[in-house]
């Protein structure tokens, strides 16, 4: 799961006006019983901000040890700090748990930049603001790490919610969610509402702020507006999907759709940005530059190096285009589109040197590992990971940041032919999954 621009996540986005939230629509088609409704105990159970990760409180061991755990749909290990580290306020102390079982096996997870390693075991795990169950789950006790934990992030571990195929050391290590579903009556589905603040948060504000919701085992209809639209999970490893078309302010990028998914497209809550393959990134930036050409932004802004600032409250949202990704639909030759605003892809950044202004970083970046729909995308939507039906649902988030003129949108259906051709088939020799 890409480190570097991965886990060091960031917040999502937008500046003024802050308080606008969409009203609920009432004309909804019912879903199958028990899958949908109110999950009051789980609403608002995430904290943090997209810049440093959204985390949920979990307890591990007996007696329970409370830890904050980063929610990551781009990896598949449940791994927690288990030794002192300068960036950790607390860590899992296996020797204090009467229910800890050592698996006598190590695990080593390298990234392009950094790594973590640890010892595998199992213990009892529960989520206080989640389903009222306790499960025995595999835990990687992190004993050594480099460039993994983030100073000030307030999380001490990671909950990899993707599939066993990308678990380390191999796919025989059952991921947490698989254990949860196997050992309880929790339906094989979870949903995420990540709420970007729309303005920079300092440390104390983050600790006090609500970051969103992880609904385990269902869908909470108070968290979204309009309808949910589903795209198939192409393959159960990452949450891989297929993008069939990209538009900037309604203008088609007109690329071979394979380029959009080269070498894959994934939905990843552990990544900050919308990350695009090199060719797609260059075309998208060219189009965004053209659309916003009334102002001349430095080259470093498009690289994510320079901030751009405006006098407080004067950010010209209207000069920036909306970005639409068309996703393969559930029906043959049918697609739907998700549309994000500049309030999602311009990330507010607090800098003391320019504190009198509203300053932003461009939160779309280049990738060599395919498209990554990170927090920039997810903060616009309520995202349903319907593992039981091998599909991912998108609806407009009730907490997304927008202005009085435009909102994020999920719309369809659209007729799109030959969508299967948009998927890229990774050569079987590629063993590199997490080495990105």
């Amino acid at each position: 799961t890409q480190h570097g621009i991965r886990l060091p996540l960031r917040s999502g986005l937008g500046g003024a006006p802050l308080g606008l939230r969409l009203p609920r629509e009432t004309d909804e088609e019912p879903e199958e019983p028990g899958r949908r409704g109110s999950f009051v105990e789980m609403v608002d159970n995430l904290r943090g901000k997209s810049g440093q990760g959204y985390y949920v409180e979990m307890t591990v061991g007996s007696p329970p040890q409370t830890l904050n755990i980063l929610v990551d749909t781009g990896s598949s290990n449940f791994a927690v700090g288990a030794a002192p580290h300068p960036f950790l306020h607390r860590y899992y102390q296996r020797q204090l748990s009467s229910t800890y079982r050592d698996l006598r096996k190590g695990v080593y997870v390298p990234y392009t930049q950094g790594k973590w390693e640890g010892e595998l075991g199992t213990d009892l795990v529960s989520i206080p603001h989640g389903p009222n169950v306790t499960v025995r789950a595999n835990i990687a006790a992190i004993t050594e790490s480099d460039k993994f934990f983030i100073n000030g992030s307030n999380w001490e571990g990671i909950l990899g919610l993707a599939y066993a195929e990308i678990a380390r050391p191999d796919d025989s290590l059952e991921p947490f969610f698989d254990s949860l579903v196997k050992q309880t009556h929790v339906p094989n589905l979870f949903s995420l509402q990540l709420c970007g603040a729309g303005f920079p948060l300092n440390q104390s504000e983050v600790l006090a702020s609500v970051g969103g919701s992880m609904i385990i085992g269902g869908i909470d209809h108070s968290l979204y507006t309009g309808s949910l639209w589903y795209t198939p999970i192409r393959r159960e490893w990452y949450y891989e999907v297929i993008i069939v078309r990209v538009e900037i302010n309604g203008q088609d990028l007109k690329m071979d759709c394979k380029e959009y998914n080269y070498d894959k497209s994934i939905v990843d809550s552990g990544t900050t940005n919308l990350r695009l393959p090199k060719k797609v990134f260059e075309a998208a930036v060219k189009s965004i530059k053209a659309a916003s050409s009334t102002e001349k932004f430095p080259d470093g802004f498009w690289l994510g190096e320079q901030l751009v600032c405006w006098q407080a409250g004067t950010t010209p949202w209207n000069i920036f285009p909306v970005i639409s990704l068309y996703l393969m639909g559930e029906v043959t030759n049918q697609s739907f589109r998700i549309t994000i605003l500049p309030q999602q892809y311009l990330r507010p950044v607090e800098d003391v040197a320019t504190s009198q202004d509203d300053c932003y970083k461009f939160a779309i970046s280049q990738s060599s590992t395919g498209t990554v729909m990170g927090a920039v995308i997810m903060e616009g939507f309520y995202v349903v990971f319907d593992r039981a039906r091998k599909r991912i649902g998108f609806a407009v988030s009730a907490c997304h940041v927008h202005d009085e003129f435009r909102t994020a949108a999920v719309e369809g259906p659209f007729v799109t032919l030959d969508m299967e051709d948009c998927g890229y088939n990774i050569p079987q020799t590629d063993e590199s999954t997490l080495m990105t």
Epitope: G4, P8, K147, E295, K296, L307, A353
Partner: antibody, heavy 116, light 107 residues
């Protein structure tokens, strides 16, 4: 408070190399690029290059390609610049500066003297 | 590379005066220009970004203006501590480049 700490002086022999450090504090190190700037006595400022500490991507002024190598150690929030094959032309003050809008924060600079 | 030209190496002024330091870019850089002040033996101190925005804590006697290729740093009511060197910088495109500097001196 954002601070960039650099050692004051480095005296080195011609033909050798030197590794300059810049220890950052007061902000999340991986969130901002780090730049290096050269200033020869009584002369202007020259941008050498920059590094993104989150993924170690670097970009250089062509004039310094092969001369400078930029690295970071995120565990200690420290950026480094190594200068190799030193000559008297490399005698200068070297500053690290953090990105933002332009360069809002600068280190105090390290004076490198190349002398036999 | 974009050349930033500060045509006056030295400028004479008096305490209490108003002085304008100019900088010319060899091509359009929009408003992506910063100004720095440097006391001899010290690191540059940021004054202005985006051509006209003052960094936090910079006294309002420093004013930046201009766009495109022509930029000006104006110091009204010059103080004795302002009698130092000033550099402009473009951060519109790589490589970032600086002007050669303008030193303020007592008349």
């Amino acid at each position: 408070e954002v601070q960039l700490q650099q050692p004051g002086t480095e005296l080195v022999r011609p033909g050798t190399s030197v590794k300059l450090s810049c220890k950052a504090s007061g902000y999340t190190f991986t969130n901002y690029w780090m730049h290096w700037i050269k200033q020869r006595p009584g002369q202007g400022l020259e941008w050498i290059g920059m590094i993104d500490p989150s993924d170690t991507y670097t970009k250089f002024n062509q004039n310094f390609k092969g001369k400078a190598t930029l690295t970071v150690d995120t565990s200690s929030s420290t950026a480094y610049m190594q200068l190799n094959s030193l000559t008297s032309e490399d005698s200068a003050v070297y500053y690290c500066a953090r990105s933002g809008v332009a360069f809002p924060y600068w280190g105090q600079g390290t004076t490198v003297t190349v002398s036999s | 590379d974009i050349l930033m030209t500060q045509s006056q190496k030295f400028m004479s002024t008096s305490v209490g005066d108003r002085v304008s330091v100019t900088c010319k870019a060899s091509q359009n850089v929009g408003r992506n220009v910063a100004w720095y002040q440097q006391i001899s033996g010290q690191s540059p101190k940021p004054l202005i970004y985006s051509a006209s925005h003052r960094y936090s804590g910079v006294p309002d006697r420093f004013t930046g203006s201009g766009s495109g290729t022509d930029f000006t740093l104006t110091i009204s009511n010059v103080q004795s501590e302002d009698l130092v060197e000033f550099f402009c910088q473009q951060y519109n495109s790589y490589p970032y480049t600086f002007g050669g500097g303008t030193k303020l001196e007592i008349k």
